[in-house]
């Protein structure tokens, strides 16, 4: 039975050009984490394998950095980075746990509109 739960950084709104950290944490299970995949829509961004370490997809190498921990740092954000990101924890013996984070990247003109919130 899968007893674990994934906690995420929560949804994030950021401004174009900035950087953010996406993180997930698996709790309430003694299952062993064998690999964590980070994906956006149907694209693989990065893999952190317990034995082999990190692999960043070539198309994201310039703007994606591993860590902290099992998290992922996205740099030089563009509006096109807006979307849903998935942390997929492969564990033994439980199986797969998935966390979801929505990242909203705003153009400066949109971000300033109404001076809505402080942006990280």
């Amino acid at each position: 039975m899968m007893t674990g739960t994934i906690e995420t950084t929560g949804n994030i709104s950021a401004e174009k050009g900035g950087s953010i950290i996406l993180q997930c944490h698996l709790s309430s299970t003694t299952a062993q984490v064998t690999q964590v995949n980070w994906e956006q829509q149907d694209q693989l961004l990065a893999i952190c394998n317990a034995d082999l370490g990190w692999h960043i997809s070539p198309s994201f190498k310039d703007r994606v950095a591993p860590g902290p921990g099992l998290g992922l740092t996205l740099q030089s954000l563009t509006v096109n980075d807006t979307g849903e990101y998935f942390c997929i924890y492969h564990t033994y013996p439980d199986g797969t746990y998935t966390g979801r984070i929505f990242l909203e990247v705003l153009e400066s003109s949109v971000a300033e509109h109404g001076a809505r919130f402080q942006i990280p």
Epitope: T8, G10, I21, E84, E107
Partner: antibody, heavy 117, light 112 residues
């Protein structure tokens, strides 16, 4: 002035599919996410999903995966929601709503869907 | 999914009253940057929902200052200082911090 104009009420038969439109005006359509919300029985509000017109990226409430499909036509600044394999449970008012920083600042007028044989 | 619980379900009022509506979430609504995406809406019969408060306590443009929001973590409150006829309707809170966004069950503000 920001406006979201939705298509009119629909009466459809069980098993059919239908598409609701939401035409946006008064702002840069591609710069904001568009959400869809279901209101059943005049009370409960449920988030169905969103689409970001700039890149077509979507996010769905798992409950509505396979039931709703979200698309946009950037040339006409229009968002669409197609509802599949309709049953009486899908009878509701559906709203489109623009969001900024995860609050829904402007809403369409709502589209009433009645599923009945 | 994050469960959002609103109380009370119904709130009978007289014009001029001050009222509070509570919204509680099953987990903290502060993201890792300390930003909380909690908003409040008023839904009047025959109209679309309208945004009142975003980011816990910020009034949306055109919203009168008799509406105020407060709270943190899992516990949030909407206060209306002097009820007017145009304030009657259903009030909803929405958490947008965690996927999927979830609404509270609503509070009906009605005349006694």
């Amino acid at each position: 002035e920001v406006q979201l104009q939705q298509s009119g009420p629909e009466l459809v038969k069980p098993g059919a599919s239908m598409k609701i439109s939401c035409k946006a005006s008064g702002y840069s359509f591609t710069g904001y996410t568009m959400n869809w919300v279901k209101q059943s029985h005049g009370k409960n509000l449920e988030w169905i999903g969103l689409i970001f017109p700039y890149n077509g990226g979507t996010s769905y409430n798992q409950k509505f995966k396979g039931k709703a499909t979200l698309t946009v036509d950037k040339s006409s600044s229009t968002a669409y929601m197609e509802l599949l394999s309709l049953t009486s449970e899908d009878s509701a008012v559906y709203y489109c709503a623009r969001s900024l920083r995860f609050s829904f600042d402007y809403w369409g007028q709502g589209t009433t869907l009645t599923v009945s044989s | 999914d994050v469960v959002v619980t609103q109380t009370p379900l119904s709130l009978p009022v007289s014009f001029g009253d001050q009222v509070s509506i509570s919204c509680r979430s099953s987990q903290s609504l502060a993201n890792s940057y300390g930003t909380t995406y909690l908003s409040w809406y008023l839904h009047k019969p025959g109209q679309s929902p309208q945004l009142l408060i975003y980011g816990i306590s910020n009034r949306f443009s055109g919203v009168p200052d008799r509406f105020s929001g407060s709270g943190s973590g899992t516990d949030f409150t909407l206060k209306i200082s002097t009820i007017k006829p145009e304030d009657l309707g259903m009030y909803y809170c929405l958490q947008g911090t965690h996927q999927p966004p979830t609404f509270g069950g609503g509070t009906k503000l009605e005349i006694k």
